[in-house]
């Protein structure tokens, strides 16, 4: 009985398949380039299994290598708008603790209205990820156009 | 002996690592914006381990959180072509059962000829995913330019 | 005791969670379109757990289905630069052994300065992946702008 229970628990507890997919809640006040995220089944298809939100920023709860992915679409945007407002840039990084602050992933919109990318990176318990959108265009809040997530891959 | 067998089966059967990578088969008739997919080793590097194809659309066989990814490249395309034919949009969503119909991921081509993105989303057994390409440009059928896949991540 | 040990080893040894994330080292000499990669904790946040580097190219050590992902950003680039130097193309493929040579993933920059994509593909022990950048623009060596990685997903 205990063996079967250990088998069942293995993937989620022992392996620690922490995962989160977030949707945009709101942008920050004028001098704050951060995007503020939200997640949970009541909101639609977003969720947090392991990681937590701390004032709209994603905090990691388990050490490991993670796949981080993001898509951001600019609101009411055309290629003309995007090029006129260049540079509009999205950066994902560890923003706290300050000792581990680093940019993990960075993209510019140039003449496009959507950026999407992903990468593998080591993250530690307590790391908080921030997503900074610099520029004068608003991100779309549509849940199929703007989203941000992480997936634990291995220790 | 039985224990060793259980160990071997754990990742694929108990954990249910369903996965599929598809290549474009054809586009739909005029009023049907859906892309029709195909997969299997006889076709090259595409495959289905768990999910199935139902009339060219991908049907999920196991509940869980999935990483869905897609890349679509437009055929005989330049930035001029793409901007001239704007809006050309790609949307991935659950199209059946109707009660669960929702758009999961959406991108426009603007002045580019390729879109690529990925996201985590909960899917249930029986969900069918459709990929809708709206616009007047054809997607490339080259297997390294247009592909669509899912990967089971956790329950 | 031995059972507990087997449990601990299961994810990394039995399941073989090979994973690598690389940063750009340098471009090749003039007639060589390949990008040369580097990885390891001394270099920052890049790493190799399983796969190895062979003269800057990634060599697979375990059979399986892999998620391959890449982002490449062009150096000192604007949409004008990118369109002027079209076609600038990035292709990821198996380059050795020659009998398995194939293009896995291909994107053009058109009017953008960054490409990013990912796909699932079967890879075999000994497969070497090459990333070919054709065109007259340099790839950025910033670690948050240009990176390449693989993640073992299942046998």
């Amino acid at each position: 009985q205990r063996f079967a229970q250990a088998q069942q628990q293995l993937p989620l507890e022992s392996l620690g398949w922490d995962v989160a997919e977030l949707q945009l809640n709101h942008t920050g006040p004028q001098q704050d380039p951060r995007l503020y995220w939200q997640g949970g089944p009541a909101l639609g298809r977003s969720f947090l299994h392991g990681p937590e939100l701390d004032k709209g920023q994603l905090r990691i709860h388990r050490d490991g290598i993670y796949m981080v992915h993001i898509q951001v679409t600019l609101a009411i945007c055309s290629s003309t708008t995007a090029s006129r407002h260049h540079p509009t840039t999205l950066a994902v990084g560890i923003c706290s603790p300050a000792s581990r602050s680093i940019s993990l992933l960075r993209l510019s919109f140039h003449q496009g209205c959507t950026i999407a990318s992903q990468r593998l990176t080591p993250l530690a318990r307590g790391d908080t990820l921030c997503t900074n959108l610099t520029g004068t265009l608003l991100p779309s809040r549509n849940t199929d156009e703007t989203f941000f997530g992480v997936q634990w891959v291995r220790p | 002996q039985r224990f060793a067998q259980a160990q071997q089966q754990l990742p694929l059967e108990s954990l249910g690592w369903d996965v599929a990578e598809l290549q474009l088969n054809h586009t739909g008739p005029q009023q049907d914006p859906r892309l029709y997919w195909q997969g299997g080793p006889a076709l090259g590097r595409s495959f289905l381990h768990g999910p199935e194809l139902d009339k060219g659309q991908l049907r999920i066989h196991r509940d869980g959180i999935y990483m869905v990814h897609i890349q679509v490249t437009l055929a005989i395309c330049s930035s001029t072509t793409a901007s001239r034919h704007h809006p050309t949009t790609l949307a991935v969503g659950i199209c059946s059962p109707a009660s669960r119909s929702i758009s999961l991921l959406r991108l426009s081509f603007h002045q580019g000829c390729t879109i690529a993105s990925q996201r985590l989303t909960p899917l249930a057994r029986g969900d069918t995913l459709c990929t809708n390409l709206t616009g007047t440009l054809l997607p490339s059928r080259n297997t390294d330019e247009t592909f669509f896949g899912v990967q089971w991540v956790r329950p | 005791q031995r059972f507990a040990q087997a449990q601990q080893q299961l994810p990394l040894e039995s399941l073989g969670w090979d994973v690598a994330e690389l940063q750009l080292n340098h471009t090749g000499p003039q007639q060589d379109p390949r990008l040369y990669w580097q990885g390891g904790p001394a270099l920052g946040r890049s790493f190799l757990h399983g796969p190895e580097l062979d003269k800057g190219q990634l060599r697979i050590h375990r059979d399986g289905i892999y998620m391959v992902h890449i982002q490449v950003t062009l150096a000192i680039c604007s949409s004008t630069t990118a369109s002027r130097h079209h076609p600038t193309t990035l292709a990821v493929g198996i380059c050795s052994p020659a009998s398995r040579s194939i293009s896995l993933l291909r994107l053009s920059f058109h009017q953008g300065c960054t490409i990013a994509s990912q796909r699932l593909t079967p890879l075999a022990r000994g497969d070497t992946l090459c990333t070919n950048l054709t065109g007259t623009l340099l790839p950025s060596r910033n670690t948050d702008e240009t990176f390449f990685g693989v993640q073992w997903v299942r046998p």
């Epitope: - | - | 750009l24 150096a75 000192i76 007259t136 623009l137 060596r141 702008e145």
Partner: antibody
Framework: EVQLVQSGAEVKKPGSSVKVSCKAS????????MHWVRQAPGQGLEWMGA????????SYNQNFKGRVTITADKSTSTAYMELSSLRSEDTAVYYC?????????????WGQGTLVTVSS | DIVMTQSPDSLAVSLGERATINCRAS??????????MHWYQQKPGQPPKLLIY???NLESGVPDRFSGSGSGTDFTLTISSLQAEDVAVYYC?????????FGQGTKLEIK
């Protein structure tokens, strides 16, 4: 091997214009910016401007205040630099130059130079 | 415009000795993980010849006694063992942005 061959020396009056040509061979003319750099006698090097022959787009050094015009003829793989409203301080050797592989503004290949003398 | 300042203006070095020329940019010429700084050699009556590109890359066919180093705003061209044929004027140049600009030149002679 890329070769850039320039037109011969010119003597011009102040206020007139000069047009120097640069014929490229041995490479893909339309894929690389062609730059023009000048060097006054006993002085250093000064970048004047560039053209991307593929689409005719130009970039100019603002120091020349609209006096320089760079053009290209893809059919003959030739670039041209015209400098107007000449004055004595425009007396210099004028070079065309381009990169060998990466299309950034460092210069692997140079023409032999064209001496333009402005004198009344 | 980025101003490039070379030092010294002239330099006399014995044959077989090391020669070092410095170049300072008025702002950083580094971007995207590269330093967009290049070095040229010019002999009388000839066009300049590219020696070093992107701060530390030796151009094909250039003897390996020439080397470049530096990042950001401060760069150095070094000739490890001066030969008679190295007598020339040396220029640094940036290509970080338009317009690219050159240093004023350093005249290298044999002592």
């Amino acid at each position: 091997e890329v070769q850039l061959v320039q037109s011969g020396a010119e003597v011009k009056k102040p206020g007139s214009s000069v047009k120097v040509s640069c014929k490229a061979s041995g490479g893909t003319f339309s894929r690389y910016n062609m730059h023009w750099v000048r060097q006054a006698p006993g002085q250093g090097l000064e970048w004047m401007g560039a053209i991307f022959p593929g689409n005719g787009e130009t970039s100019y050094n603002q120091n020349f205040k609209g006096r320089v015009t760079i053009t290209a003829d893809k059919s003959t793989s030739t670039a041209y630099m015209e400098l107007s409203s000449l004055r004595s301080e425009d007396t210099a050797v004028y070079y065309c130059a381009r990169n060998s592989y990466y299309d950034y503004a460092w210069f692997t290949y140079w023409g032999q130079g064209t001496l333009v003398t402005v004198s009344s | 415009d980025i101003v490039m300042t070379q030092s010294p203006d002239s330099l006399a070095v014995s044959l077989g000795e090391r020669a070092t020329i410095n170049c300072r940019a008025s702002k950083s010429v580094s971007s995207s993980g590269y330093s967009f700084m290049h070095w040229y050699q010019q002999k009388p009556g000839q066009p300049p010849k590219l020696l070093i590109y992107l701060a530390d890359n030796l151009e094909s066919g250039v003897p390996d006694r020439f080397s470049g180093s530096g990042s950001g705003t401060d760069f150095t061209l070094t000739i490890s063992s001066l030969q008679a044929e190295d007598v020339a004027v040396y220029y640094c140049q940036h290509s970080r942005e338009f317009p690219p600009t050159f240093g004023q030149g350093t005249k290298l002679e044999i002592k």
